[in-house]
């Protein structure tokens, strides 16, 4: 029993990626997850 | 078929507190995300809790977040609700809910359990 | 948070006719990245749980009758029911699913005159 199941995130951008309940802008190099994106293709919270 | 069936509600006093299980079957249930959501006396629809598929990441409006803790058993196919501190406003009907994999509307909703908080 | 306005809060309808109520929302549901509005209608018969009627503000859930057609964009939504049956009776919300927390409209209560 499906829902609309997406391979990808439908993002701009290469950047994206499923964290959560949403695709979010992953971190850049050497800074770690803070917390997920709230809203879909957002920036997640990095350190 | 989709199914999803609330149980454990009760009436509990003002401060006390209260687990939800929600079971679900007729799909991979460690593929979605889940939520709560109640549905107050007056009929309206309040969001109360959210954890992911995958690596659980847990979500909740600010009207909960303390009191409430969302959790999941996908060997057991179950969601909980544990809900501390709890309040007259805090009575209602409480549904799970199965999220949509890519719009994160409820797809799927559960028949309810109520929880009436009073002295 | 984003706050969902529904109007009007009750309508009563004879069959067959065409019904629209209105869904407003405090900041825009559209996604610039994927050009989708993130707003879903359910509709609520006495007695029972919500069901998905719509997704992504026009997008039907299977298995709905296409007499429920969704529209809008932005801001404004609408909800309208070409030609509105005995079983409609219900109550109707809309539930924004754009962004945390997840907000529904107050309802609106639909009567068959």
């Known amino acids: 029993q499906g829902g609309t199941r997406s391979p990808r995130c439908d993002c701009a951008g290469d950047f994206h990626k499923k964290i959560g309940l949403f695709c979010c802008r992953g971190c850049p190099a050497g800074h770690y997850l803070k917390a997920p994106c709230t809203e879909p293709c957002g920036n997640s919270t990095c350190l | 078929e989709v199914q999803l069936v609330e149980s454990g509600g009760d009436f509990v006093k003002p401060g006390g507190s209260l687990k939800l299980s929600c079971a679900a079957s007729g799909f991979t249930f460690n593929n979605y995300g889940m939520s709560w959501v109640r549905q107050t006396p007056d009929k309206r629809l309040e969001w109360v809790a959210a954890?992911?598929?995958?690596?659980?990441?847990?979500y909740y409006p600010d009207t909960v977040k303390g009191r409430f803790t969302i959790s999941r058993d996908n060997a057991k196919n179950t969601l909980y609700l544990h809900m501390s501190s709890l309040k007259s406003e805090d009575t209602a009907m409480y549904y799970c809910?199965?999220?949509?994999?890519?719009?994160?509307?409820?797809?799927?909703w559960g028949q309810g359990t109520t929880l009436t908080v009073s002295s | 948070d984003i706050v969902m306005t529904q109007s009007p809060s009750s309508l009563a309808m004879s069959l067959g006719q065409r019904v629209t109520m209105n869904c407003k929302s405090s900041?825009?549901?559209?996604?610039?990245?994927?050009?989708?509005?993130?707003l879903a209608w359910y509709q609520q018969k006495p007695g029972q749980s919500p069901k998905l009627l719509v997704y992504?503000?026009?997008s039907r859930e299977s298995g709905v009758p296409d007499r429920f057609i969704g529209s809008g964009s932005g801001t404004d939504f609408t909800l309208t029911i070409s030609s509105v049956q005995a079983e409609d009776l219900a109550d109707y919300f809309c539930?924004?699913?754009?962004?945390?927390?997840?907000?529904f409209g107050s309802g609106t209560k639909l009567e068959i005159k």
């Open positions: 992504f503000a026009s």
């Open positions: 900041q825009s549901l559209l996604n610039s990245h994927n050009q989708k509005n993130y």
């Open positions: 809910g199965r999220h949509d994999d890519y719009g994160n509307h409820f797809d799927y």
């Open positions: 954890i992911s598929s995958g690596v659980t990441y847990t």
């Open positions: 539930q924004q699913h754009y962004s945390t927390p997840f907000t």
